[in-house]
Interface confidence: low
Amino acid sequence: APRGTQAEESPFVGNPGNITGARGLTGTLRCQLQVQGEPPEVHWLRDGQILELADSTQTQVPLGEDEQDDWIVVSQLRITSLQLSDTGQYQCLVFLGHQTFVSQPGYVGLEGLPYFLEEPEDRTVAANTPFNLSCQAQGPPEPVDLLWLQDAVPLATAPGHGPQRSLHVPGLNKTSSFSCEAHNAKGVTTSRTATITVLPQQPRNLHLVSRQPTELEVAWTPGLSGIYPLTHCTLQAVLSDDGMGIQAGEPDPPEEPLTSQASVPPHQLRLGSLHPHTPYHIRVACTSSQGPSSWTHWLPVETPEGVPLGPPENISATRNGSQAFVHWQEPRAPLQGTLLGYRLAYQGQDTPEVLMDIGLRQEVTLELQGDGSVSNLTVCVAAYTAAGDGPWSLPVPLEAWRPG
């Protein structure tokens, strides 16, 4: 740090005083010097370092009419809203010719009620789930001791006994408030009051109970919800893009989910109006008067195939002697799965029914028994998937072939 030489007497006639106060205080340090000739610029030092951005004002008053006469120079350093970083030793510094002069030091100190660096924050926690709260305060004066309060009740016999910066709460069963008091020699400061809202635990063990082509029955185990009964649970289902689109940690599905509410108990819900043979992802959250639990992870599920919902369309059957030609079109109704083929049945008035599996073709030529003289022949067709046969078409009579 610069030092004044001993060759000449110090020009300072007034040195900075001392300031001690609480945070936020505003104060002024002042130094005065008397010099001959042109007045120098006064610099301020804190702990030996020049303050480049000091809030200082300099006043110069001539003591004579000639520039070479003496001048009185007064510099004032304003400290607004005193902070810990403002504390230290303050001096004035001037350069006169080839010499450097510094004033006697003044001291700025901070002393008051504790100041919070960190206070407990509002948060939500699942019932009976451990969590931590933080509180940190400083002086001076030190030491600062903390006392935690839960619902305005101290958690220790005195400040400094019990938890300090971090309070570990093993779990709550009701919404509670927490605050901390910071104590030092000057008194006590109380932190903000944090409200810890107790929500239901995340449901567990979400699983399928049974499944149908257009509905899934799911069940889950509710989590603890403290003193607040669950009011309902919400289940979301979303079509999987390829069955792999939603990973366990992914927060949102690719499209708007189908949302259903379940009264509880029982912790079970039948999800209807689903597509057959389709992969879905489902998740559940449960709600009490305090709010909802977190969602479970997305669970991949799949509806099974169903049978076709309608018969084949536009069936035509024409007969030419001992042969009959039958053709049809795929059912317009949903297939509810992968079409595996068609079954055809034909029967005469007094003859047994003949059943055939046609496969995926949509036409067939039938070789009729005998000379084709059987009367009142009718044909029915049904589509089938892996789940079984769809409804049979109405009987279609075989019409004699007429050359066009």
Epitope: R204, H207, R211, P300, V301, P304
Partner: antibody, heavy 122, light 107 residues
Framework: QIQLVQSGPELKKPGETVKISCKAS????????MNWVKQAPGKGLKWMGW????????TYADDFKGRFAFSLETSASTAYLQINNLTTEDMVTYFC???????????????WGQGTSVTVSS | DIQMTQTTSSLSASLGDRVTISCRAS??????LNWYQQKPDGTVKLLIY???RLHSGVPSRFSGSGSGTDYSLTISNLELEDVATYFC?????????FGSGTKLEIK
């Protein structure tokens, strides 16, 4: 390849506790649930329940609530079956079997351990 | 609970025979029917799941069929290594339940 290796046969006295281990290899342990199945000598298979290896959540069939406990040591890819207060009724073979995907148990038990026989005798 | 019934507790067949083992569920299980093989040494293997899907490594002589409540396992060309007890199991509803088993022997 996928393997489930169970601990060896156990000889216990009535009232004692047994803990059977099932070490999995060849797949991601926490992606698939672990089922436990009981088989009395010369008898059929009886499903005891399963444990979700992702969350550690066990599900017990009604007949196995109380003295039976499923647990995990995920870092060792190992599932455990503990039976407390053994009786001669527990003198059977226990199988672990790899099962459902994450928390969805409704998949076949596609790989089985070799079985652990428990003898209970005073 | 869903009851799984295997009415045939044991059957005897000759090598090369076609053997069918049946299983009935007390209610519709939506095709979630699995078949397991337990060898005389006690080892258990999955053979077929979802009525008819062969598990990896299972020979194609094994096949499954059925729907609703009635299901069957067929071995088309019996081999010596097929001597075992066969169990059906429903995977549609918890708790899972097994049939009582059908023991297959060679004549």
């Amino acid at each position: 390849q996928i393997q489930l290796v169970q601990s060896g046969p156990e000889l216990k006295k009535p009232g004692e506790t047994v803990k059977i281990s099932c070490k999995a290899s060849g797949y991601t342990f926490t992606k698939y649930g672990m089922n436990w199945v009981k088989q009395a000598p010369g008898k059929g298979l009886k499903w005891m329940g399963w444990i979700n290896t992702y969350t550690g959540e066990p599900t017990y069939a009604d007949d196995f609530k109380g003295r039976f406990a499923f647990s995990l040591e995920t870092s060792a890819s190992t599932a455990y079956l503990q039976i407390n207060n053994l009786t001669t009724e527990d003198m059977v073979t226990y199988f672990c079997a790899k099962g459902g995907y994450y928390s969805n148990p409704i998949y076949p038990m596609d790989y089985w351990g070799q079985g652990t026989s428990v003898t209970v005798s005073s | 609970d869903i009851q799984m019934t295997q009415t045939t507790s044991s059957l005897s067949a000759s090598l090369g025979d076609r053997v069918t083992i049946s299983c009935r569920a007390s209610q519709d299980i939506n095709n979630y029917l699995n078949w397991y093989q337990q060898k005389p040494d006690g080892t258990v293997k999955l053979l077929i799941y979802y009525i008819s899907r062969l598990h990896s490594g299972v020979p194609s002589r094994f096949s499954g069929s059925g729907s609703g409540t009635d299901y069957s396992l067929t071995i088309s060309n019996l081999e010596l290594e097929d001597v075992a007890t066969y169990f059906c199991q429903q995977g549609n509803t918890l708790p899972f339940t097994f049939g009582s088993g059908t023991k297959l022997e060679i004549k």
